[in-house]
Interface confidence: medium
């Protein structure tokens, strides 16, 4: 969490941002909130990016003002116009690119004063893994697949019964470049699976950590997976 204040204490407002991560090719949110004003026409929101000459986005007098917007953000940004009045200056960024990573500044002017806060925005690719019994194998094996990751993640297997066991000798992980030549498909196979056990396939890079669990019993399997972004720190 980054909380920024105006330069002069008397005319400062609190602005709060949250460091976040964008999944390339998808839409992302750069979070920013501020002390609200009662008049929309008195609120100015400016988003800037370190190293970029033009503005990322500007909103003033109740509407977008994009005459000074930098080319790299053309047609890709929007604020939540109906939520500005309640202090939400978050920016929606469409079709996130690797090059969108960097330090952004959320700069706010209201009738109460000015304030700004920075946020670190990381970009990469992350996706939910699916674990299944690999029915192509001769012995019982598990296959963990996740379609899109970048940078290349690490993959670690764990089991509920054999806690702390190292499965690196009985697993095999491969990374296959996807058609856009940036993200990769992750496939990891675990051999010598025992029944009445729950196995976890954990995929992690510096942006996200995802886990696919599968409970294997004699008669059936049950799976679930979850994903967590690693750098959601508020400022």
């Amino acid at each position: 969490l980054i909380i920024g204040f105006g330069i002069s204490g008397r005319h400062s407002i609190t602005v709060t941002t949250v460091a976040s991560a964008g999944n390339i090719g998808e839409d992302g949110i750069l979070s920013c909130t501020f002390e609200p004003d009662i008049k929309l026409s008195d609120i100015v929101i400016q988003w800037l990016k370190e190293g970029v000459l033009g503005l990322v986005h500007e909103f003033k007098e109740g509407k977008d003002e994009l005459s000074e917007q930098d080319e790299m953000f053309r047609g890709r940004t929007a604020v939540f116009a109906d939520q500005v009045i309640v202090g939400n200056a978050s920016l929606r960024l469409k079709n996130v690119q690797l090059t969108d990573a960097g330090t952004y500044k959320c700069y706010i002017i209201t009738s109460k004063g000015k304030g700004n806060a920075n946020l670190e925005y990381k970009t990469g690719a992350f996706s939910m893994p699916e674990v299944n019994v690999d029915y192509n194998a001769s012995s019982e094996t598990l296959r963990c697949e996740a379609p899109r990751w970048f940078p290349q993640p690490t993959v670690v297997w764990a089991s509920q019964v054999d806690q702390g066991a190292n499965f690196s000798e009985v697993s095999n992980t491969s990374f296959e470049l996807n058609s856009e030549n940036v993200t990769m498909k992750v496939v990891s196979v675990l051999y010598n699976v025992t029944i009445n056990n729950t196995y976890s396939c954990m995929i992690e890079n510096d942006i996200a950590k995802a886990t696919g669990d599968i409970k294997v019993t004699e008669s059936e399997i049950k799976r679930r997976s979850h994903l967590q972004l690693l750098n959601s720190k508020a400022s």
């Epitope: 299944n132 029915y135 192509n136 029944i195 004699e218 008669s219 059936e220 399997i221 049950k222």
Partner: antibody, heavy 116, light 106 residues
């Protein structure tokens, strides 16, 4: 007595959506996964997906992913199947069933007819 | 996906006959479940975990098999047994059913 009671028959036009409900009673709803299975006229059984009512976690048959949505309302012990972008091949009886143990429980089935 | 092939697709038998239905999976699935379905009704669990009888199912029904090949046997067919039978696997997603075997009166 454990019961799964489904909503009534539906007639829909191609491209529309349908939402089928399955109200559970006689057991603790959040303790057992709910499965959805369909059966086209004169055909066999096809698994659509499953949902854990305790946390709404779902697993889908890839064939239906993106078109089928499984949800639950724990306050009324009801599971729902919503199927969108309907086509004539979706004409079938849709069943909900409770996760199988030594006894299995099924709804009576809901006939969904897709016709222009 | 694991495909399940039942044979025969249909059969005609008389009351008192011994009936055997087989189910073959494209990959090893360890355990099989069997259902009975009568016209206009929901399926009913018959056998679970390959050989265990579901609650209230008569002992004339039995199941066996392992790996990819499984069998459902009705030792002495009764009038109420005329129905369609399905095998089912829950060991690999997506869960799948056999195409069904219809048991008719000869």
């Amino acid at each position: 007595e454990v019961q799964l009671v489904q909503s009534g028959a539906e007639v829909k036009k191609p491209g529309a959506s349908v939402k089928v409900s399955c109200k559970a009673s006689g057991y603790t709803f959040t303790n057992f996964w709910i499965h959805w299975v369909r059966q086209a006229p004169g055909q066999g059984l096809e698994w659509i997906g499953e949902i854990d009512p305790s946390d709404s976690y779902t697993n889908y048959n890839q064939k239906f992913k993106g078109r089928a949505t499984l949800t639950v309302d724990t306050s009324t012990s009801t599971a729902y199947l919503e199927l969108s972008s309907l086509r004539s091949e979706d004409t079938a009886v849709y069943y909900c069933s409770r996760e199988i143990t030594t006894v299995d429980y099924w709804g009576q089935g809901t006939l969904v007819t897709v016709s222009s | 996906d694991i495909q399940m092939t039942q044979s025969p697709s249909s059969l005609s038998a008389s009351v008192g006959d011994r009936v055997t239905i087989t189910c073959s999976a494209t990959s090893s699935i360890s355990y099989m479940h069997w259902y009975q379905q009568k016209p206009g009704k929901a399926p009913k669990g018959l056998i679970y975990d390959t050989s265990k009888l579901a609650h209230g199912v008569p002992s004339r029904f039995s199941g066996s098999g392992s790996g990819t090949d499984f069998t459902l046997t009705i030792s002495s067919l009764q009038p109420e047994d005329f129905a369609t039978y399905y095998c089912h696997q829950r060991r690999s997603y997506p869960f799948t059913f056999g195409q069904g075997t219809k048991v008719e009166i000869k």
